[in-house]
Structures are given as C-alpha cells and as structure tokens.
Interface confidence: low
C-alpha cells in the first residue's frame, strides 16, 4: 500500500479540517513552549504544501516522509535554541534520529501556567468573532499540556467544545448552560490524557507484548461473544494505532483508527451486539463510542475452563507448540468469563498460569504438578477484592476530602522523598477512586477501581522518571506493569528516610488564602499535611488530625477577621508552635 506522496495520501484520507487539526496537535505536543501564532503559521505552510502534493504527487519534496517534512518545518523555528536549549540539537540529526530526539524531549510536566477560564461573555464573543481560531487555540492549549493526548480523540473533544459554545452562547443563561459542559470536558479530558499516557508507557517501557496482553484481556471482556481470532485481529490493529500515536505519527494513527472503526462496524455480527448505536454516528463520535462501548452479554453456555487448561493431558503439548497463542487463548477465555475482574488482575492470573506451566511442563509428572493451578489464583483474586472493600468502606466513612487526606498520609509515609506537589496531585487523584467506583454494583467495582488506580500510579511513575528520587518508586514502576499497584500497596513506612527539617516558612499563610476557591484551599491544606508527615513520618493519625483541625479553625478564624493579614501574622506563629508541640 505504497503512495508516491505520503502527505498527499494522508491529506486525501483525512480531509483538510482533520489534517490541519492533527498537524497542529503534533507540533504543539513537540514544541510545547512555542506561541500559538507560530504554530498556526507552521500548520498553514504544511497544509499549503500538502495541497500542492495532492494536485501533483510528483512535485518537488512531495515524496519525502512525514517525519522529514514535519521535522524540517519545526526546525525553522527561530527561537529553538533560546526556548528549548538542547532540544535544538535534534535539528542537527537526520531522520529517523531527529524525530526520535523530538520524542525524547516531550515533557509530561511542562512549566506552563494553569489555564484560566475567562468570563462567559468574553469567551462567547471570541467564539463568534473567529470560531476557527478559537477552536485551534483549544487544540493547542490542551496538546501542549498533554503531549501524549490521543490525537484523534482530541479532535472529538474539540468538536464537543465547539458544540457547547454554539449551543450555549445562544442560551438565555449562558453561564448555566456552558460552565457545566466545560467542567465535564475538562474532567473527561484529564482522564482521557491519563489513560492514554498509560498505553504509551506500556508500549514504550514494556513492549508491544505487554500492550497486546492488556488489549486481549480488555477486548475479551467487552466482546465475550467474539471468537479468539476476531479478538486477535482487533488487538493487532489497535496496537498499530496506539504505537503510531505514541510515536507522534498522528496522521497515520488517525487514519488507521478510522479504518478500525470501519472494520468493526462492517463486522458487528462477529464482534458484539452493542456496536449498532455507535456505528450510526459520524466518524469522531463513532470511534469514541466504540472505544467506550459497554461489555456485551456473556454467552450463556460457556464451558468450564478447567477442561482445556487443567484437566487436559495436552496442556504442555499445546503450550510448547505455540506459547504466546496458548497463553493468549487462556487470557481470552478467562477474561470473557470475568467482566467483574480488573484487567490487571486478569493479566496477573495469566502470568501465574504461565509460571506454573513453565515449572510443571519440565517436571516428572506435569499433570500432577499443575492440577491445582486454579487454586493458586485465589489469593491473587482476593487481594484486590479486599483492597476495594476496605477502601470503599473508608471512603464512605470519611467522604472524598478526608479520604484523600488518608491517602496523602499513607503515600507520604511510603515514599517521602517524592516532591510534595507530586504527592498532592497523585493522592488527590487516587482519592477520586471512591466517588468514581464505590457507588457501582459489586461486579463493577474492582475493574473500575484497580484499572483507574493503574492510570493514576502511571502518572506518579512518569513524573518520577523525569526526576528520580526514590528507589522504591523506581522498583515499583519498572519491575512489572501488572504488579505496580500491589507493589505500591505493599510499601510500608520508609524507615531509612531522614525526616525533613522543620521550616516555619512552609507553614506561613496569608490573607490571600481567604479568596481561594474551595479546591485551591484543599490543595493548600493538603500541601501542609504532606509537609507535616515529611517532618514527622511517625506521627499518628490522631496527632495529624488534631493539627489539621487546628489549621482549619485558624484559617476560618482569620478569614472572618476584619484585618485578615494581621490575624494571619499573629495567629500563624501560634499555630506553628502548637503544631510542633502536638507532634513532639
């Protein structure tokens, strides 16, 4: 399937609007500090060039690879050295090294200001004045903050963003209409970014075998009526799509994703009865819908797994003949029977089964050796079940904010070397598992909770890799993808940690505290809590609760005072002294 001009091929396949959007996303994810206007200029130049290639595929430079064309364009940015430092050295390289160099410099935590939402009237005016620029700005701002955001999905978010403004800027109460929609898009966008980051980490750090295993388990849960061969085909195609997007090959990724959606909709009968409503939708919505589709009903007559995978005398023969296929079939069969298990648990079970066969198929009596293999699964299944049960009980008892605080204390004691902002961000997100999953019926709790925790802990791993400070974190992040969460759960208080010296500055607060939003106030308090634990890692729950209650009372008192700043100046040192005494 070779084309004289790759850029013309993708332009024709994707259409001008999607082509321009994806190129803007690609450039914004690579050069995260560049101003918007610079990116728009580059995108327009690439688009004009693509059009000349569509008109004549033999025109000069039209036969160049997309990496060559895009890299050449990025390297024309005048301020590359001043803005990006050593990233400018990438431009001295030839392809494919140059593109690899750009990828290496993607920053998961770019030093960019938080996005401030203007007044609704201001946004509506901007939307009406120049809709195209308004939407491009959205793509640019999201892409530069989330350099691994799944690009075709970002186009879907932009379409929803546009629809929200088109509807709400006409409404009687613009704010009431628009703000909840923007909040929903923001929260869904952050979740989508984090999920995709785990997919890219899985591919980049653990190889395509790890990603394929994840995909076999997840797609087998979603499509339990599909044959193994059908699931395998979908897994192969999905792996290609995500490998491309994680490599920055966004045009190919979007094109292949559209092809996969087309294939699924043309083959619904052999995949799932749940696809029908997705397949009537336009492309972006259809692909999103297929990715999020609910699990199909399990076939009623599925036989016991034991016959083929334990009782059969041919287990070792089948395993030896084609190990990965046999293990893939085992994972498929187990996953389609267990929508109530997390994908990570299913992968642990497959790993345990593989380890048993490796040991037993070399034994004198293999069948005798592996006869009890399913019994060995029990503790692996019970561990996440108990974890979910205990944490949901704690969440229901404490509520979200205090549950987050419990996790903050727990994780700071485990890995006190990690930076305070990272501990606050990760623990706040870990704490959101309660509201997200604990209200669900029993059969959906574990897949919701453990697979969400895997996404959040990946964020910790990604941030920690940029600035490694803890051997424990490195160990949990790198040794096994499927055992990351149990590895972190098993960590205890770090006895080797030397407590941080007390710094009064960390616990000095000012009147600006009173004008913060509720969320910002929580973050301030949680930052103080982490610093307290770093100072006194062996403090008891009761001691910490006492200090935090005093803190809340002190802030409330000063925010009600006539002279707020004077109150903070006077009461602050008293609070610090009382806290030190309470933790002594």
């Amino acid at each position: 399937d070779t084309h004289k001009s790759e850029v013309a091929h993708r332009f024709k396949d994707l259409g001008e609007e999607h082509f321009k959007g994806l190129v803007l996303v690609a450039f914004s994810q690579y050069l995260q500090q560049c101003p918007f206007e610079e990116h728009v200029k580059l995108v327009n130049e690439v688009t004009e060039f693509a059009k000349t290639c569509v008109a004549d595929e033999s025109a000069e430079n039209c036969d160049k690879s997309l990496h060559t064309l895009f890299g050449d364009k990025l390297c024309t940015v005048a301020t590359l050295r001043e803005t990006y430092g050593e990233m400018a050295d990438c431009c001295a390289k030839q392809e494919p090294e140059r593109n690899e160099c750009f990828l290496q410099h993607k920053d998961d935590n770019p030093n960019l200001p938080p996005l401030v939402r203007p007044e609704v009237d201001v946004m509506c005016t901007a939307f009406h004045d120049n809709e195209a620029t308004f939407l491009k700005k959205y793509l640019y701002e999201v892409a530069r903050r989330h350099p691994y955001f799944y690009a075709p999905e970002l186009l879907f978010f932009a379409a929803r963003y546009k629809a929200a403004f088109a509807e709400c800027c006409q409404a009687a109460d613009k704010a009431a209409c628009l703000l909840p929609k923007l909040d929903e898009l923001r929260d869904e966008g952050k979740a989508s970014s984090a999920k995709q980051r785990l997919k890219c980490a899985s591919l980049q750090k653990f190889g395509d075998r790890a990603f394929k295993a994840w995909a076999v388990a997840r797609l087998s849960q979603k499509f339990p009526k599909a044959e193994f061969a059908e699931v395998s085909k979908l897994v192969t195609d999905l792996t290609k799509v995500h490998t491309e997007c994680c490599h920055g090959d966004l045009l190919e990724c979007a094109d292949d994703r559209a092809d996969l959606a087309k294939y699924m909709c043309e083959n619904q009968d052999s995949i799932s009865s749940k696809l029908k409503e997705c397949c009537d939708k336009p492309l972006l919505e259809k692909s999103h819908c297929l990715a999020e589709v609910e699990n199909d009903e399990m076939p009623a007559d599925l036989p016991s797994l034991a016959a083929d995978y334990v009782e059969s005398k041919d287990v070792c023969k089948n395993y030896a003949e084609a190990k990965d296929v046999f293990l893939g079939m085992f994972l498929y069969e187990y996953a389609r029977r267990h929508p109530d298990y997390s994908v990570m648990l299913l992968l642990r079970l497959a790993k345990a089964y593989e380890a048993t066969l490796e040991k037993c198929c070399a034994a004198a009596d293999p069948h005798e050796c592996y006869a009890k293999v399913f019994d060995e699964f029990q503790p692996l299944v019970e561990e996440p079940q108990n974890l979910v049960k205990q944490n949901c009980e704690l969440f229901e008892q404490l509520g979200e904010y205090k549950f987050q605080n419990a996790l903050l204390v727990r994780y700071t004691k485990k890995v006190p070397q990690v930076s305070t902002p990272t501990l606050v961000e990760v623990s706040r997100n870990l704490g959101k598992v309660g509201a997200k999953c604990c209200k669900l019926p029993e059969a959906k709790r574990m897949p919701c909770a453990e697979d969400y925790l895997s996404v959040v802990l990946n964020r910790l791993c990604v941030l920690h890799e940029k600035t490694p400070v803890s051997e424990k974190v490195t160990k949990c992040c790198t040794e096994s993808l499927v055992n990351r969460r149990p590895c972190f759960s098993a960590l205890e208080l770090d006895e080797a940690y030397v407590p941080k010296a007390f710094n009064a500055e960390t616990f000095t607060f000012h009147a600006d505290m009173c004008t913060l939003s509720e969320k910002e106030k929580q973050v301030k308090k949680q930052t103080a809590l982490v610093e307290l634990v770093k100072h006194k890692p062996k403090a008891t729950k009761e001691q910490l609760k006492g200090v935090m209650d005093n803190f809340a009372a002190f802030v409330e008192k000063c925010c009600k005072a006539d002279d707020k700043e004077a109150c903070f100046a006077e009461e602050g040192p008293k609070f610090v002294a009382a806290s030190q005494a309470a933790l002594a």
Partner: nanobody
Framework: QVQLVESGGGLVQPGGSLRLSCAAS????????MSWVRQAPGKGFEWVSS????????RYSDSVKGRFTISRDNARNTLYLQMNSLKPEDTAVYYC?????????SGQGTQVTVSS
C-alpha cells in the same frame, strides 16, 4: 513498518566471543527500552538482557550475568550484545525485541552455535 534485523551470529568454540547487532527502523528507537531474547532448539523463548531507552540501566538473566554485555547506539538505531566466555548451553537463535523482559521478538533472529 517496525523492522528489527539481527546479525553477527555464527559458529564459535566454547570460551569464544561474538558480538550481535540489531538494526532497528520504522519506530522511535531512542524512546524505547530494548531486549535480547533467545530460543534454544525445542525450547521456548528465554529473556537474556534488557537496556533502557537512554542506555544507562541494564539487566541480565542469571545465566549470562558477567559474561554478556548489552549496549545501544541511539544515533545509529542499533542494539548490541557482546557475548564472552560462550558455553554450549548458549546455543540458540538470538532475537532483539522492543521493550523489557516480557518483549516479543519480531525479527528473523541470528543463529549462535557454541561447539568444539
């Protein structure tokens, strides 16, 4: 299209040395950890060694530790395996693969035979 082409194998006497190379193309080599795995006649795949994307973190199976050295040249998109003090039990087809210890080979491999 992801391509991994292994080379450098051959017949060598016990105690001898070989250097295997793996030329990678079609993906962002610099951004990925890489591994060597091997398959002895009639056996399954056995992980040999891994190296992270930057090249500073290397891991080895107990059977080759101290004898084999994994390295990479990101500028040349190439992965290497220096094999010293070879033993007859090192006889296998050697494959390079994208990722860590669980990586799946996709190339043709290169045959290493250790025999007197």
């Amino acid at each position: 299209q992801v391509q991994l082409v292994e080379s450098g194998g051959g017949l060598v006497q016990p105690g001898g040395s070989l250097r295997l190379s793996c030329a990678a193309s079609g993906f962002t080599f610099r951004g990925f950890g890489m591994s060597w795995v091997r398959q002895a006649p009639g056996k399954g795949f056995e992980w040999v060694s891994s190296i992270n994307s930057g090249g500073e973190d290397t891991r080895y199976s107990d059977s080759v530790k101290g004898r084999f050295t994994i390295s990479r040249d990101n500028a040349r998109n190439t992965l290497y395996l220096q094999m010293n003090s070879l033993k007859p039990e090192d006889t296998a087809v050697y494959y390079c693969a994208i990722g860590g210890a669980g990586a799946t080979p996709s190339g043709q491999g290169t045959q290493v035979t250790v025999s007197s």
